[in-house]
Amino acid sequence: AIVFIKQPSSQDALQGRRALLRCEVEAPGPVHVYWLLDGAPVQDTERRFAQGSSLSFAAVDRLQDSGTFQCVARDDVTGEEARSANASFNIKWIEAGPVVLKHPASEAEIQPQTQVTLRCHIDGHPRPTYQWFRDGTPLSDGQSNHTVSSKERNLTLRPAGPEHSGLYSCCAHSAFGQACSSQNFTLSIADESFARVVLAPQDVVVARYEEAMFHCQFSAQPPPSLQWLFEDETPITNRSRPPHLRRATVFANGSLLLTQVRPRNAGIYRCIGQGQRGPPIILEATLHLAEIEDMPLFEPRVFTAGSEERVTCLPPKGLPEPSVWWEHAGVRLPTHGRVYQKGHELVLANIAESDAGVYTCHAANLAGQRRQDVNITVATVPSWLKKPQDSQLEEGKPGYLDCLTQATPKPTVVWYRNQMLISEDSRFEVFKNGTLRINSVEVYDGTWYRCMSSTPAGSIEAQARVQVLEKLKFTPPPQPQQCMEFDKEATVPCSATGREKPTIKWERADGSSLPEWVTDNAGTLHFARVTRDDAGNYTCIASNGPQGQIRAHVQLTVAVFITFKVEPERTTVYQGHTALLQCEAQGDPKPLIQWKGKDRILDPTKLGPRMHIFQNGSLVIHDVAPEDSGRYTCIAGNSCNIKHTEAPLYVVDKPVPEESEGPGSPPPYKMIQT
């Protein structure tokens, strides 16, 4: 049965952050694991993909990842399927929105002493806690003339008077994070002496060393005062500027100009308007420095003609958000057509060969521009330049079979011989252009060869038959030195093959004819009874019409084959005594004797003081020890043949004589006594 060792469990997740649903399975055989979301199979994407058996989220999405996930393990052989417990995400998020007028229906209907209700359109999960601000100053619940309904995200002013005039903003925070209103609401209830906002400064993003302008205007009767402050509460005037704001200018209309902006100038600027009566109005705007990071590299892509493919360009991080566009051959791609840009994606529909080339993704903002190229290859089915031809190849020489094709990308060529894939080794080599080289053609290379040329778009194949033109050669070549046993019958074979069956004949090397007792029968030299005079040099000649003739020289030696006159016997010796293993052989040429003891040749030059091999071939071992026990082999050899004979040597302890045994008692073994 399939068992889940680890099951996915429901969990909290943060919008845009990583997450992992774990799944681990144990089963008797292999299984494959896939995931369901609300009962439908989950397809891998760059954002959400299988990681082993688990499901990995690079960035949780509250819309696409809401629902029930389930891990399914299937044994495809038996068909058995097991399903994990359901798991879902409690996704925490927060999203900014504007401050809007809820009541009355329009700004034109706002009059002194009427009720005004504003709504904060910031939403999130879990439900965030809201904070209201007038002209940047927090409004606490229960203060005079206003109430805050957190559940309905409303701020109610009842009744609204001139003192309530100002710029209303809201912020909300939750376990996920914090957001402030994307658009604020200016409430204006006339009290001529109160300062009223005419123009509020906006957040500005500028490139380094560029200029930034904040506009700020208030109206009142009499005219109000206006003052600019930077983050650390330092006032900015044309007479007294802070050291880091030397290039700041305050205009008569209240606008603040900053030239050649540097990183230290970034921050919050406050514009304060004060009327003859009423509270000061504080408006805030932030100066951000534009920035843009580098773009990640693209892998080269290979597509097939007729398919639809997409290449995603991930924009670099930057402020403001960089705009992204695709170009090809220096021309910006349209937003529709066959090859077009959709969002950040390059889309190639019904791909054609002409679509191949370099496509560039551009990203730009105030801080600059970044670009990254992607090389797109359109794979084509290979076409023939030269097919393999039926060929006649000469044995022993290199042979070549062509398989020349062209395609994009460069095709892969494989060769088959008798339907079996040829793997490159010392005999076969496939060149870069697809040609097969057979390094040294052999007779059995005569068969069918098939080459297959492939790209991702498809493959073509062709076959050819190879006929091997056999060279004129001895099969096998006669041994150059051969021995014949004196006074015995002997044969010396000689055979050859070629394109045509060759004629084979023997002759003596000196050109003299063969004696009558020596016959040449279809290449086999036959000696009815070998004599000493038969020794000498002979030549085997093989010839045919198209290939001429070849010769093989053989030196025949007449020998008396080896026989043993004396062979070593099974021998038992008392420890400390001397063992003698006799061996004598005869033959012509006179044989040499070698001994092998306990599986190693006894080298006469390295025997040491205890061992000695006599001229006649006998082996003597003095002061024998138990480790000398074993099989000893006498090997007799000459230039014509070799023979061996063996016998065991046993080394035993000398028995202690018992009282009952007289001095004449025989030993318990057949012994050599010395």
Partner: antibody, heavy 112, light 110 residues
């Protein structure tokens, strides 16, 4: 003994409908996936569709709309409902549990 | 639409030969390994030989072996036996619970 037996095959006119049954014995359908595969005379195997252990169904693109797989776990039987039949639907229809266990097949002939 | 292409479509060989059948898919199979090979003889249901690319099914001789990954796979019979002359099919499984068969390779006596 674990086995599968198909039934319901026979002669049907073009445009007609037929329901094939695959009765399982020796195991419970609710823990297994079941496939339908067909083989036209002298031709290769062709996957029709699958019903998984929860009863969800998936089909080959050519089978969507005309063919429907269902099951009755109380009868331990899987069905293949075939509508708007054509001459090219003539084949032996096999049901299979996973890759290993196959039924003997049932012949469907669509002809006028 | 997924297309699985087997090559060759027909193959003649002799007892003792080494035989290789290839299977190419138009897209990668699930987990790069969800591929099976079947043997079918006339009038019989298919018999599973190899599952998950290279695992030998129960009772299948060790002369059968499978290899590959992604979208390209091979079935090898190391030394052809008289009982091996039949039709062979590859079957791939894909994301979304979709399966497909190759068109088959008929192995006949040379």
């Amino acid at each position: 003994e674990v086995q599968l037996v198909e039934s319901g095959g026979g002669l049907v006119q073009p445009g007609g409908s037929l329901r094939l049954s695959c009765t399982a014995s020796g195991f419970s359908l609710s823990n297994y996936v079941m496939n339908w595969v067909r083989q036209a005379p002298g031709k290769g195997l062709e996957w029709v569709g699958i019903i998984d252990s929860s009863g969800s169904t998936y089909y080959a693109s050519w089978a969507k709309g005309r063919f429907t797989i269902s099951r009755d776990t109380s009868k331990n039987t899987v069905y293949l409902q075939m509508n708007s039949l054509r001459a090219e639907d003539t084949a032996v229809y096999f049901c299979a549990r996973g890759l290993y266990l196959w039924g003997q097949g049932t012949l469907v002939t669509v002809s006028s | 639409e997924i297309v699985m292409t087997q090559s060759p479509s027909t193959l003649s060989a002799s007892v003792g030969d080494r035989v290789i059948i290839t299977c190419q898919s138009s897209q990668s199979v699930h987990n790069n390994n969800l591929l099976a090979w079947y043997q079918q003889k006339p009038g019989k249901a298919p018999k599973l030989l190899i599952y998950y690319t290279s695992n030998l099914a129960s009772g299948v001789p060790s002369r059968f072996s499978g290899s590959g990954s992604g979208a390209e796979f091979t079935l090898t019979i190391s030394s052809l036996q008289p009982d091996d002359f039949a039709t062979y099919y590859c079957q791939g499984g894909y994301n979304g619970n979709i399966y497909a068969f190759g068109q088959g390779t008929k192995l006949t006596v040379l």
